[in-house]
C-alpha cells in the first residue's frame, strides 16, 4: 500500500508510517516500525503529560511555593498538573496562579459587592444614598442608614456614605399635645408645651 500522507487522531507520521501517540501519563521511548508498536513509558513521580503525545520527556508538576502564599488545591497525577491556590485571605495574581496577593479591603464609603475568592480579588462598590460603610473591610457590605422613625426618634444628624444617621428624641419644645376639652372650656386646640405652661400660670 502507498505510504500515508496523513494519520488518524492519536497517531503521528514518521518515516512514511503512522505511529500511535503515547497516551496521557506516558512519554515516547521509541517510534513504531513496520513490526513494532510505539514504545511508551509512564511518567515518573512528580511528572505528567496531559495529552496524547510524542514527547520524550514528561513535564514537572507545578510547585506551590508557600513563600509566595501558595498551597496545593489538587495534587497532580501522571496525567494532570498540580493545581495551586492561595492561602486564606489571599488570591492569585493570574490565571496560572503563580503567586498571591492579599485581598483588597473596601475603604469607608465603599462596601463589598463580591467577596474575594482564591482566584479573584474583592469587588467594592460605592455606598449609594441611604447606605454607609464606616470601616475598611474585605467582607462588610454597605449597611442601610438607621430608620429613626421606626424607633420613634427623629434624625438629629444626616447620614453620609461613611456615617450612619444620628437619631435623637423628639424636641420637647416643639412636641405637639392635644389639650382636652375641660382645660380649654370645651374648645379643642393644638398648642405647644410653652403655651400650655403659660395658660396654667394665668
Amino acid at each position: 500500500p502507498e505510504p500515508p500522507t496523513a494519520c488518524r487522531e492519536k497517531q503521528y507520521l514518521i518515516n512514511s508510517q503512522c505511529c500511535s501517540l503515547c497516551q496521557p501519563g506516558q512519554k515516547l521511548v521509541s517510534d513504531c516500525t513496520e513490526f513494532t508498536e510505539t514504545e511508551c513509558l509512564p511518567c515518573g513521580e512528580s511528572e505528567f503529560l496531559d495529552t496524547w503525545n510524542r514527547e520524550t520527556h514528561c513535564h514537572q508538576h507545578k510547585y506551590c511555593d508557600p513563600n509566595l502564599g501558595l498551597r496545593v488545591q489538587q495534587k497532580g497525577t501522571s496525567e494532570t498538573d498540580t493545581i495551586c491556590t492561595c492561602e486564606e485571605g489571599w488570591h492569585c495574581t493570574s490565571e496560572a496562579c503563580e503567586s498571591c496577593v492579599l485581598h483588597r479591603s473596601c475603604s469607608p464609603g465603599f462596601g463589598v459587592k463580591q467577596i474575594a475568592t482564591g482566584v479573584s480579588d474583592t469587588i467594592c462598590e460605592p455606598c449609594p444614598v441611604g447606605f454607609f460603610s464606616n470601616v475598611s473591610s474585605a467582607f462588610e457590605k454597605c449597611h442601610p442608614w438607621t430608620s429613626c422613625e421606626t424607633k420613634d426618634l427623629v434624625v438629629q444628624q444626616a447620614g453620609t456614605n461613611k456615617t450612619d444617621v444620628v437619631c435623637g428624641p423628639q424636641d420637647r419644645l416643639r412636641e405637639q399635645k392635644l389639650i382636652s376639652e375641660e382645660d380649654l372650656g370645651g374648645e379643642q386646640k393644638l398648642i405647644s408645651e410653652e403655651d400650655l405652661h403659660h395658660h396654667h400660670h394665668h
Partner: antibody, heavy 122, light 108 residues
Framework: EVQLVESGGGLVQPGGSLRLSCAAS????????MNWVRQAPGKGLEWVSI????????YYADSVKGRFTISRDNSKNTLYLQMNSLRGEDTAVYYC???????????????WGQGTLVTVSS | DIQMTQSPSSLSASVGDRVTITCRAS??????LNWYQQKPGKAPKLLIY???SLQSGVPSRFSGSGSGTDFTLTISSLQPEDFATYYC??????????FGQGTRLEIK
C-alpha cells in the same frame, strides 16, 4: 481459520472478582492488538479495553478504569481480563475481539469470540 | 470522546426492500467508520470498514458510503437472514472506541 474462545464467566457477588480468558488461534497473535467488548442484556455494544500486540500497552474505558486489568500471554496465545470490585452494571456478555492493527489506536475488529456471560448479583 | 448516533433506532421492512441506516459522528472522522451486524445470541460480525470497503465474505447487497460526520449503510434487497441489529463504530480517534447505539431491523 481464526478462532477466539472466551471462558471464565459466571455468577459473582457485588465486590467480587472474576478472570476471563480468550484463547486465540488461526493467526499470529502477537501481531495484533486485542480488545474486550461487552453487551449488557438487551443493550448495545460497549468497548471495555484494548492491549497492543507486542509491548502490551493498555487502555481502558472510564467505566472500568482502576477495576479491570487487561493482559496477554503471547506464548500461550491467550488474552485475559481480570475484573475486580464488580458491580451490578458490569453484568453483560463479554466478547474478545481481534483488532486489525498492532497498536492501541487500531480497530476495526475483524473477528469476535462467541462471548461469555458475567452476572453480578447477590 | 467522539459520540456516534444511529437512526432510526428500529426499523420494520420486508424481504426485497431497500433499506438505509444512518450514522452521525459528533465530529469529523474522515472515512474511519465501520459497520457490524449482530444476530440474537451471536457475536457481532464486521460488514464494512473504512466507510465503504466490504469485508471479505460479505454479500454485495451491503454497501456503505459517507465521510466526515454522516454515513449510511444500505442493503439493496433485504434477505431473510439480514434481519438483525446493526452497529456503526468510529476508528478515527481511538481509544476509546465508540459504537452507535444500534439499529434493530425487524420483519414487517
Amino acid at each position: 481459520e481464526v478462532q477466539l474462545v472466551e471462558s471464565g464467566g459466571g455468577l459473582v457477588q457485588p465486590g467480587g472478582s472474576l478472570r476471563l480468558s480468550c484463547a486465540a488461534s488461526g493467526f499470529t497473535f502477537s501481531s495484533y492488538a486485542m480488545n474486550w467488548v461487552r453487551q449488557a442484556p438487551g443493550k448495545g455494544l460497549e468497548w471495555v479495553s484494548i492491549i497492543s500486540g507486542t509491548i502490551g500497552k493498555t487502555y481502558y474505558a472510564d467505566s472500568v478504569k482502576g477495576r479491570f486489568t487487561i493482559s496477554r500471554d503471547n506464548s500461550k496465545n491467550t488474552l485475559y481480563l481480570q475484573m475486580n470490585s464488580l458491580r451490578g452494571e458490569d453484568t453483560a456478555v463479554y466478547y474478545c475481539a481481534k483488532d486489525t492493527e498492532r497498536d492501541i489506536t487500531g480497530s476495526p475488529f475483524d473477528y469476535w469470540g462467541q462471548g461469555t456471560l458475567v452476572t453480578v448479583s447477590s | 470522546d467522539i459520540q456516534m448516533t444511529q437512526s432510526p433506532s428500529s426499523l420494520s421492512a420486508s424481504v426485497g426492500d431497500r433499506v438505509t441506516i444512518t450514522c452521525r459522528a459528533s465530529q469529523s472522522i474522515s472515512s474511519y467508520l465501520n459497520w457490524y451486524q449482530q444476530k440474537p445470541g451471536k457475536a457481532p460480525k464486521l460488514l464494512i470498514y473504512a466507510a465503504s470497503s466490504l469485508q471479505s465474505g460479505v454479500p454485495s447487497r451491503f454497501s456503505g458510503s459517507g465521510s466526515g460526520t454522516d454515513f449510511t449503510l444500505t442493503i439493496s434487497s433485504l434477505q431473510p437472514e439480514d434481519f438483525a441489529t446493526y452497529y456503526c463504530q468510529q476508528s478515527y480517534s481511538t481509544p476509546p472506541i465508540t459504537f452507535g447505539q444500534g439499529t434493530r431491523l425487524e420483519i414487517k
